[in-house]
Structures are given as structure tokens and as C-alpha cells.
């Protein structure tokens, strides 16, 4: 089905807050079309917090969205603003910090049973084999039992991001999944696209690392929606 | 048509050492995970480890880490599961099946290891 | 690990019948299970997937639901070529840890 191919993704068991590898997990879409479960483990804080002007949430950190600076304000004039905390008041789950989703107007916390990872891949395969029924592939992030053994290095098999060792992330090539690095500042991200894709994402990408989100980049603003380039910039 | 052809029969003896193959076809080799199961006689399945073959990364069950060595050949599309010196325990049936999103879906036919003094 | 408890270890069903085998995961696995059908003398074959799939070529005789802790694979109607030991297999966390077995005959 296609929430399959939607979920197909998802990196499972990322870091701790505060602990393993950079933990900065992006957004990722949940089992219902249309409805974003914002996933990761780290509160971004409002200092030095600089105006990012954006039309949409997926332009914004993975701890920030896409709204009006202003209650009633002109819906014109957006800017990514922080993430709201648990307990506070939201409209949608884009509002809430990762780790929370929006239930009844509260950010509640999502206790580890949503979808997390910023993963969908730039390379896109519809496929016509003996599998082109999209087996379900879906990924859900839980904590992890105690380790049983060494963590993997890159290319190592995986099933889920604690496998794999500090600075890496298990994540989707062609068929399987293995430990591949947290991107760096300036290298290339995936946002996902809450509408989704018809086709198959068959490699993946990390999230970005410690204190990077995955922005569109400033200059491709102008750009088609469907070509525009995210990196993984500084807060 | 995807075929996993694994080598045949072997009878050895405790101190031994002994390397089974899995030769692939019918589908691209560095695409997917290989896994290697045992099935002791009339037990359960157990799965002992895994190799992608794109940059030869494994892992391993930690109970049969450090006891057999999972490798690829990526020329010959051929994976390998090897002991360096083989116990009784090790007697059982041994698949190697090939990872789809998770799942193992095509296994080849099974490689009997009988170990006997 | 995650311990998988196959049950019934046995169970005999008359052709038409429907047959039911049980996994419970000592973890919460989502709907991360895999169900796999093993007649004598031959490997595995892989019947329903992660998110309770149907594989291609497997008929809608063979079903399976459940996500969590507690799975179920349905057979039914069940037929004489049936007969085979089931497992179910989770894939949520390494390591990859099969159930105990369940054999079917039928009566």
C-alpha cells in the first residue's frame, strides 16, 4: 500500500537525548496520510533564534514550524518558529517538539510509538518484479533492550539505528539496511514530503547531526518545489 | 528467477574446519543482505548472522560471534559461512536466505554439516 | 533478544477448518513479524511479511494479523498440502529471533 511505501523509512531506535550518537532526527511521515508525527529526542532552545522566513513546515528545522509570528497575524508573513513544548497548545503535530504530537490541542508526548527519521532518499525506483506489491516495511521507533553486541561500523547490518556506532544511523540501501554516517553541516538532506511519493525511496540518508536541521537552502528558494535542495545547516 | 544454490553435504570431524557457500543469480548480489540460519535436528530456526555484500559489513548473533566468520565473494555472487575448528554442537542444517526489506524471503535449499567423531 | 512464543506447539485441523497459531514477543515489535511455513525436507518459504503482507503467490487462504506484542497467522480453509511447521520470525531488532514451531496436520 502506499502508507507502506510512506513508512518504508523510518530509521528505527535513534539516540537518546544527550547520549550515542548525534540524536537530531528529522520529521517522518506517520501511518495516516497527511498527518506528520514530528519524531527526535532534542529541544531546540530560542536563543539567538533568527528569523527563517518559510511558506511551509518542511522548510523548517525538525524543532521548529512553519507559522505566522503573530496570533491573527498575516498569514503572508511566515517564519519558522520553535517548537512548542509538552502541555502547550497546537493546531497540528508540525507544532509540537520532537518527541510530542498534537492530541485535542495539547502536545502530548508520542512516547515512542510514531514514526521518526528524515530518510526518504533522492533516488526513486518503481519497480515491476515479483515484489512490486510493496511488501510493508514499516519502521517504529521503540528504545532498545540492552545491546548484545558491538555496535556496527559503517556498512554494517542493521535493523535499527542503535546497531549501528555513535555518528551513524541504520538506514535503507537498495533492499536492506545498513549503518551509514549522520550527515554533516552543508552535506545534502531529505525532507519528507508529507504527500508522499509513488515510487520507492531505496537508499536513505541519516538525519543531520548535533545541532543541525535540514533546511531548503536560501538560494533555491526560487526554485521549483520539486527541485529545491535541503543541507543540513545550524540552527 | 532469483536461486540461492548452496554446496552440498558435508561430514567432518570435531577440530575441523570447514567452509559452506551460497552461490546467487537472478538478481543483483550487492542489493541485499545475505543471512546464514541454522536448524539443529527437529529445533527451531537461528539466525546466526548477516553480511551486505556493498561494503562486506556484517553482524552477527552473539551467540555464534567469534565461532564462525560470514564473508562474500562479490565476483561470483557467492556468500560464505566458515568454521575454523568445528565442535559436535555444530551439526545441524545450515540456510542462507536473502534479505528483503527485513523479511528473508528466497532461501536456498540448505547445507547438512554433520560433525562426528 | 527478544523471546518468541509459538503456540500451539501442535495442532491437528480437519480440511475445510480453520487453523490458528499465536506469537507473543517478549518486546513491543509494531507489526514487525514474518510468518514462514517450512514443510519437510525443504527450506523456509516466507508467507506473510512485515505489516501483516501477503506475499506474492501465497494464497488468500493464509492471513495474519495483529502488531505490538500479539500475532496471529489464520489458516482457512485449511487443505491437505497445508501440512508443514509455521514460524513466525521478528525483524524489529537484532538479533533476528524465530518462534518455536508450530506443526500442523491435519486430521
Known amino acids: 500500500t502506499l502508507n507502506s511505501v510512506l513508512n518504508s523509512n523510518a530509521i528505527k531506535n535513534l539516540p537518546p537525548p544527550l547520549g550515542g550518537a548525534a540524536g537530531h532526527p528529522g520529521s517522518a511521515v506517520s501511518a495516516a496520510p497527511g498527518i506528520l508525527y514530528p519524531g527526535g529526542n532534542k529541544y531546540q532552545t530560542i536563543d539567538n533564534y533568527q528569523p527563517y522566513p518559510c511558506a511551509e513546515d518542511e522548510e523548517c528545522g525538525t524543532d521548529e514550524y512553519c507559522a505566522s509570528p503573530t496570533r491573527g497575524g498575516d498569514a503572508g508573513v511566515q517564519i519558522c518558529l520553535a517548537c512548542r513544548k509538552r502541555r502547550k497548545r497546537c493546531m497540528r503535530h508540525a507544532m509540537c517538539c520532537p518527541g510530542n504530537y498534537c492530541k485535542n490541542g495539547i502536545c502530548v508526548s508520542s512516547d515512542q510509538n510514531h514514526f521518526r527519521g528524515e530518510i526518504e532518499e533522492t533516488i526513486t525506483e518503481s519497480f515491476g518484479n515479483d515484489h512490486s506489491t510493496l511488501d510493508g516495511y514499516s519502521r517504529r521507533t521503540t528504545l532498545s533492550s540492552k545491546m548484545y553486541h558491538t555496535k556496527g561500523q559503517e556498512g554494517s547490518v542493521c535493523l535499527r539505528s542503535s546497531d549501528c556506532a555513535s555518528g551513524l544511523c541504520c538506514a535503507r540501501h537498495f533492499w536492506s539496511k545498513i549503518c551509514k554516517p549522520v550527515l554533516k553541516e552543508g552535506q545534502v538532506c531529505t525532507k519528507h514530503r508529507r504527500k508522499g511519493s509513488h515510487g520507492l525511496e531505496i537508499f536513505q540518508r541519516c538525519y543531520c547531526g548535533e545541532g543541525l536541521s535540514c533546511r531548503i537552502q536560501k538560494d533555491h528558494h526560487q526554485a521549483s518545489n520539486s527541485s529545491r535542495l535541503h543541507t543540513c545547516q545550524r540552527h | 528467477e532469483v536461486q540461492l544454490l548452496q554446496s552440498a553435504a558435508e561430514v567432518k570431524r570435531p577440530g575441523e574446519s570447514l567452509r559452506i557457500s551460497c552461490k546467487t543469480s537472478g538478481y543483483s548480489f550487492t542489493e541485499n543482505t545475505m543471512h546464514w540460519v541454522r536448524q539443529m535436528p527437529g529445533k527451531e530456526l537461528e539466525w546466526m548472522g548477516g553480511?551486505?555484500?556493498?561494503?562486506?559489513?556484517?553482524s552477527y548473533n552473539q551467540k555464534f560471534k567469534g565461532h564462525v566468520t560470514i564473508s562474500v565473494d562479490k565476483s561470483s555472487s557467492t556468500a560464505y559461512l566458515q568454521w575454523s575448528s568445528l565442535k559436535a554442537s555444530d551439526a545441524a542444517m545450515y540456510y542462507c536466505?536473502?534479505?528483503?526489506?527485513?523479511?528473508?524471503?528466497?532461501w536456498g535449499q540448505g547445507t547438512l554439516v554433520t560433525v562426528s567423531s | 533478544d527478544i523471546v518468541l512464543t509459538q503456540s500451539p506447539a501442535s495442532l491437528a485441523v480437519s480440511p475445510g477448518q480453520r487453523a490458528t497459531i499465536t506469537c507473543i514477543t517478549s518486546?513491543?515489535?509494531?507489526?514487525?513479524m514474518n510468518w514462514y511455513q517450512q514443510k519437510p525436507g525443504q527450506p523456509p518459504k516466507l508467507l506473510i511479511s512485515?505489516?501483516?503482507t501477503l506475499r506474492p503467490g501465497v494464497p488468500a487462504r493464509f492471513s495474519s494479523s495483529g502488531s505490538g506484542t500479539d500475532f496471529t497467522l489464520t489458516i482457512n480453509p485449511v487443505e491437505a498440502n497445508d501440512v508443514a511447521n509455521y514460524y513466525c520470525l521478528q525483524s524489529d531488532n537484532l538479533p533476528y529471533t524465530f518462534g518455536q514451531g508450530t506443526k500442523l496436520e491435519i486430521k
Open positions: 518486546t513491543d515489535i509494531d507489526d514487525d
Open positions: 553480511i551486505n555484500p556493498h561494503k562486506g559489513g556484517t
Open positions: 536466505a536473502r534479505d528483503w526489506l527485513g523479511a528473508m524471503d528466497y
Open positions: 512485515e505489516g501483516n
